[in-house]
Amino acid sequence: AVNGTSQFTCFYNSRANISCVWSQDGALQDTSCQVHAWPDRRRWNQTCELLPVSQASWACNLILGAPDSQKLTTVDIVTLRVLCREGVRWRVMAIQDFKPFENLRLMAPISLQVVHVETHRCNISWEISQASHYFERHLEFEARTLSPGHTWEEAPLLTLKQKQEWICLETLTPDTQYEFQVRVKPLQGEFTTWSPWSQPLAFRTKPAALGKDT
């Protein structure tokens, strides 16, 4: 392995998965590397093989149990190491003492559905997936709506500063096709980041009735 610029980032999904990405400039694509997890107060150790996701980055998931099982708590510390094979030995390339609830990234929201649609309005709901009960209501959401002729990047962000799993989109254009996405973030954790965006939900507003506006 070469001593290029390295980065090792991991996130806990709040239940039973730690996802890690390891990148190193100039590293060989066929280098064999793995992430090893060593908790301070659990009986298990876990390893996952880092698989290439781009020219200089690798990723893997430490699956700690059933998807909805609560495998770690706020007091856990998991020492994470990147180990890469160099000849007959393994070399430690990165190491961190990982506090799961300081490094959260939840799963993308699921089950998006149109509850009610009108000419200018649409009410949409969703669910959060594999989120810890520890959060209670301490979550926030961001949503965006894709209008015709625009890109997702141009879409203004709507912020929901509470655990609200629905939104009423207003000032929409009648008889128009839209797409909608939402993402979630716990309020807890210094290095916590937004979940991936949900799968887009396509919907169409109702056409305006002749002679009146509903």
Partner: nanobody, 126 residues
Framework: QVQLVESGGGLVQAGGSLRLSCAAS????????MSWVRQAPGKGLEWVSS????????DYADSVKGRFTISRDNAKNTLYLQMNSLKPEDTAVYYC???????????????????RGQGTQVTVSS
């Protein structure tokens, strides 16, 4: 704002011991890996040792391995370097440094720090 203040340096005879301390403030200490680096007179910065956020991982430069011990007390927001069997070539200004995240990279341990203290002078006489 992030502050790192070293103390514990001084003049000591070869074979003696010193314990350096680094008081940290302005950030959640346990969330960051830390290190000690040193600068001898007329030389560049030399990495000495690194430690993970809860002390479960440590690394040392070959020149100090077996003589120096890095540790931390997260309740006191303090990093330590216990220096035993000191040699004249250990004479330097010693700095504590914070890595920019909870991670450090053993093959390139001098990289990735974002804050450093003002340093404390260690002089080892023969």
């Amino acid at each position: 704002q992030v502050q790192l203040v070293e103390s514990g340096g001084g003049l000591v005879q070869a074979g003696g011991s010193l314990r350096l301390s680094c008081a940290a403030s302005g950030f959640t200490f346990s969330n960051y890996a830390m290190s000690w680096v040193r600068q001898a007179p007329g030389k560049g910065l030399e990495w000495v040792s690194s430690i993970t956020g809860f002390g479960r991982g440590t690394d040392y430069a070959d020149s100090v391995k077996g003589r120096f011990t890095i540790s931390r007390d997260n309740a006191k927001n303090t990093l330590y370097l216990q220096m035993n069997s000191l040699k004249p070539e250990d004479t330097a200004v010693y700095y504590c440094a914070r890595y920019s995240s909870s991670t450090y990279y053993p093959p390139t341990p001098a990289r990735g720090t974002d804050y450093r203290g003002q340093g404390t002078q260690v002089t080892v006489s023969s």
